[in-house]
């Protein structure tokens, strides 16, 4: 069979949640492989995911070094088999990704309600402080460690017997709300970064209701 040309990658897309960051692209390779490079605006181009037939590359280890930096990636297409390189002067084809700033753009993962505790007519609801892959001094930081007061949580709560929802907000991971004595309530939380223009909100957490296992009740 005759030779074909290498094809440049296209549809380069960042997929990132809580800083776990993967670059995806097309097409599935035929007689070619890919190598990804990543750089900050002022840094070196670092090769990752060498000579791969995958169409994704996990770049988490690179972006967590400084989540406030802006990153650019590029995907090189290398001939591997009965193909010809279409780059000029032996240079391989490559395609650039959109710019990506993790702090501003990573999706907020679905939060989890860790616990709730009722004392009389007050309920304390605690949101799990999810661990990220961002490190400082060899320990992994939580979402709150990374975002600080930029991150708030919205609590949606309602009586099990009705559909009318109330909301509360906190810039910590805890809510203290007033409830009617003798009523069971259900809760759901959402992570929000109000200062953002994109990816401001997470999906809602799974609903947790009083009278189920996560709660503690004290008169």
């Amino acid at each position: 069979s005759g030779t074909t040309n290498t094809v440049a990658a296209y549809n380069l897309t960042w997929k990132s949640t809580n800083f776990k960051t993967i670059l995806e692209w097309e097409p599935k390779p035929v007689n070619q492989v890919y190598t990804v490079q990543i750089s900050t605006k002022s840094g070196d181009w670092k090769s990752k995911c060498f000579y791969t037939t995958d169409t994704e590359c996990d770049l988490t280890d690179e972006i967590v070094k400084d989540v406030k930096q802006t990153y650019l990636a590029r995907v090189f297409s290398y001939p591997a088999g009965n193909v010809e390189s279409t780059g000029s002067a032996g240079e391989p084809l490559y395609e650039n990704s959109p710019e990506f700033t993790p702090y501003l753009e990573t999706n907020l993962g679905q939060p989890t309600i860790q616990s709730f505790e009722q004392v009389g007519t007050k309920v304390n609801v605690t949101v799990e402080d999810e661990r990220t892959l961002v490190r400082r001094n060899n320990t992994f930081l939580s979402l709150r460690d990374v975002f600080g007061k930029d991150l708030i949580y919205t609590l949606y709560y309602w009586k099990s017997s009705s559909s009318g929802k109330k909301t509360a907000k906190t810039n910590t991971n805890e809510f203290l709300i007033d409830v009617d004595k003798g009523e069971n309530y259900c809760f759901s939380v959402q992570a929000v970064i109000p200062s953002r223009t994109v990816n401001r909100k997470s999906t809602d957490s799974p609903v947790e209701c009083m009278g189920q296992e996560k709660g503690e009740f004290r008169e």
């Epitope: 090769s47 791969t52 088999g81």
Partner: antibody, heavy 117, light 106 residues
């Protein structure tokens, strides 16, 4: 012109330590991964691992994990391969080679290490 | 790790003859290089990406293969072709070399 210049031949006794070097010039040293390859006398090539000079990330062949250490000094564009306690079986030619795509192919001239009592 | 087995270990041929060098991988490989090494010299990239000739490599050389079986072919041996040839896979870490094939003058 891209050049990789390695340090000279070494003769050592078992148990001694050693650090051999590979100095890069004619290119941005921090931008390219640097490979190390071993060739024992009369034998084939073995990939030991590689290091990225900008941040010292290493990819090491597990076979060499407890035997040798890769490091760099960015300020003098030099990569190092070192041993804390040499064995007779470390006797070999060691090459550094810049990680490149395709026809780009830059190797050091090799450093001969002889370990003998 | 992926083990590369080269055969034959030694190929004794005369100038003008055709040489066929094989490299068999223990699991599928998508990116294979070949290196030439002459006595007292560092290895040189000879074929990259299975079938692409490195700069300055004569057209009498060719590379082919896929999956686990790869071949370097020299259509008509010239005196300067007598050397050791190594295959190397870069599909998965650790990158590995074959044991080499020595092409010697018969």
């Amino acid at each position: 012109e891209v050049q990789l210049v390695q340090s000279g031949a070494e003769v050592k006794k078992p148990g001694e330590s050693l650090k051999i070097s590979c100095k890069g010039s004619g290119y941005s040293f921090t931008s390219y991964w640097m490979n190390w390859v071993r060739q024992m006398p009369g034998k084939g090539l073995e990939w030991m691992g590689m290091i990225y000079p900008a941040d010292s990330e290493t990819r090491l062949n597990q076979k060499f994990k407890d035997k040798a250490t890769l490091s760099v000094d960015k300020s003098i564009s030099t990569a190092y391969l070192q041993w804390s306690s040499l064995k007779a079986s470390d006797t070999a030619m060691y090459y550094c080679a810049r990680e490149d795509y395709g026809s780009s192919d830059y190797w050091g001239q090799g450093t001969t290490v002889t370990v003998s009592s | 790790e992926i083990v590369l087995t080269q055969s034959p270990a030694t190929l004794s041929l005369s100038p003008g003859e055709r040489a066929t060098l094989s490299c068999s991988a223990s699991s599928s490989v998508s990116y294979m290089n070949w290196y030439q090494q002459k006595p007292g010299q560092s290895p040189r990239i000879w074929i990259y990406g299975i079938s692409n000739l490195a700069s300055g490599v004569p057209a009498r050389f060719s590379g082919s293969g896929s999956g686990t079986d790869f071949t370097l072919t020299i259509s008509s041996l010239e005196p300067e072709d007598f050397a050791v040839y190594y295959c190397q896979q870069k599909s998965s870490f650790p990158w590995t070399f074959g044991g080499g094939t020595k092409v010697e003058i018969k």
